[in-house]
């Protein structure tokens, strides 16, 4: 029998490499059974997670899962860092694992890496292929 506890499916050690100036959606996959929990995003500052007020968020509902999305429109250099989503469920606070955004400032990288650059710098290819991951259903 499946548990009806709320689950926040942010994977441990998850990372995203993104460019300043681009739009980006940070997804918190939320599983719940009956009433949708109240979910918030916070940004880690040392050991404290500072709640993100006045930020654009939205819900995307799918068949077996919902996504609470934090919108970056656009991404700014100081968006670099680690984020966590939290859900209030039956008086319990459930916290996700943290997910880290690595923001490349377009001023210091005046253009996106070319295919040749990606081939000669495999760590870039790894970051873009492996970390810049979205859920597709």
């Amino acid at each position: 029998k499946e548990s009806c506890d709320v689950q926040l499916y942010i994977k441990r050690q998850s990372e995203h490499s993104i460019l300043a100036g681009d739009p980006f959606e940070l997804e918190c996959p939320v599983k719940y059974c009956a009433n949708r929990p109240h979910v918030t995003w916070c940004k880690l500052n040392g050991t404290t997670c500072v709640k993100l007020e006045d930020r654009q968020t939205s819900w995307k509902e799918e068949k077996n899962i919902s996504f609470f999305i934090l919108h970056f429109e656009p991404v700014l250099p100081n968006d670099n860092g680690s984020y966590r989503c939290s859900a209030n469920f039956q008086s319990n606070l459930i916290e996700s694992h943290s997910t880290t955004l690595y923001v490349t400032d377009v001023k210091s990288a005046s253009e996106r890496p070319s295919k040749d650059e990606m081939a000669s710098r495999p760590w870039l290819l790894y970051r873009h292929h492996h970390h810049h991951h979205h859920h597709h259903h």
Epitope: Q7, Y9, I10, K11, R12, Q13, S14, P29, K31, L44, T47, N64, I65, S82, E95, H97, S98, H130, H133, H135
Partner: antibody, heavy 121, light 112 residues
Framework: QVTLKESGPTLVKPTQTLTLTCTFS??????????VSWIRQPPGKALEWLAH???????RFNPSLKSRLTITKDTSKNQVVLTMTNMDPVDTATYYC?????????????WGQGTLVTVSS | DVVMTQSPLSLPVTLGQPASISCKST???????????LNWLQQRPGQSPRRLIY???KLDSGVPDRFSGSGSGTDFTLKISRVEAEDVGVYYC?????????FGQGTKVEIK
């Protein structure tokens, strides 16, 4: 009941590509949170984690072997496939697959029986 | 990479007596989420590994309570309160806090 079973060639030649299949039951990689890892163990030596694939096709690799590894899943067949290129005699090992989910608490809670792969000309 | 160092590498024990295995890591295994992803595996002769303990001290289902895990930060211990014949094998610690996940070199427990 969760079970995993590895299959593939027992002998490969140096420079060849190894393809191993992990067939599992009792859980599904279409379920949010699920994942499968590959781990190997050379004869008489310690374990080494190789690669992991999650339900959403996110993949993690051991950086020391990343350039040689590919991991894929076939959700409908309940299978995960590992390929390792340019095999060398030092890659002779028992290769295991094991289950592990997104939150770290069920990392490697179930293991396959392992399959011994010998690399020799 | 985080290096996991176990000691001793070989542990001859008397049936019914206690046994203790140490595992040290080169970095703290306390994660930012407050959990410590330090786990212990048992590998009996000719068998695949089996998870005994996860998150430092939580016993897997079916694991006898003579096994216990403790520790924090970089120093961890697996204890067997009274060794039985079926406990013979190699014990590995491994960490899932830092990427890539790494294992200790193993401790072989045998009966004197």
């Amino acid at each position: 009941q969760v079970t995993l079973k590895e299959s593939g060639p027992t002998l490969v030649k140096p420079t060849q590509t190894l393809t191993l299949t992990c067939t599992f039951s009792g859980f599904s990689l279409s379920t949010f949170g699920m994942g499968v890892s590959w781990i190997r163990q050379p004869p008489g030596k310690a374990l080494e984690w190789l690669a992991h694939i999650y339900w959403d096709d996110d993949k993690r690799f051991n950086p020391s072997l990343k350039s040689r590894l590919t991991i894929t899943k076939d959700t409908s067949k309940n299978q995960v496939v590992l390929t390792m290129t340019n095999m060398d005699p030092v890659d002779t090992a028992t290769y295991y697959c094991a289950r592990g989910n997104w939150d770290g608490e069920t990392y490697f809670d179930y293991w396959g029986q392992g399959t011994l792969v010998t690399v020799s000309s | 990479d985080v290096v996991m160092t176990q000691s001793p590498l070989s542990l001859p024990v008397t049936l019914g007596q206690p046994a203790s295995i140490s595992c040290k890591s080169t970095q703290s295994l306390l994660d930012s989420d407050g959990k410590t992803y330090l786990n212990w595996l048992q590998q009996r002769p000719g068998q695949s590994p089996r998870r005994l303990i996860y998150l430092v001290s939580k016993l897997d289902s079916g694991v006898p309570d003579r096994f216990s895990g403790s520790g924090s930060g970089t120093d961890f211990t697996l204890k067997i309160s009274r060794v039985e014949a079926e406990d013979v094998g190699v014990y590995y610690c491994w960490q899932g806090t830092h990427f890539p996940w790494t294992f200790g070199q193993g401790t072989k427990v045998e009966i004197k």
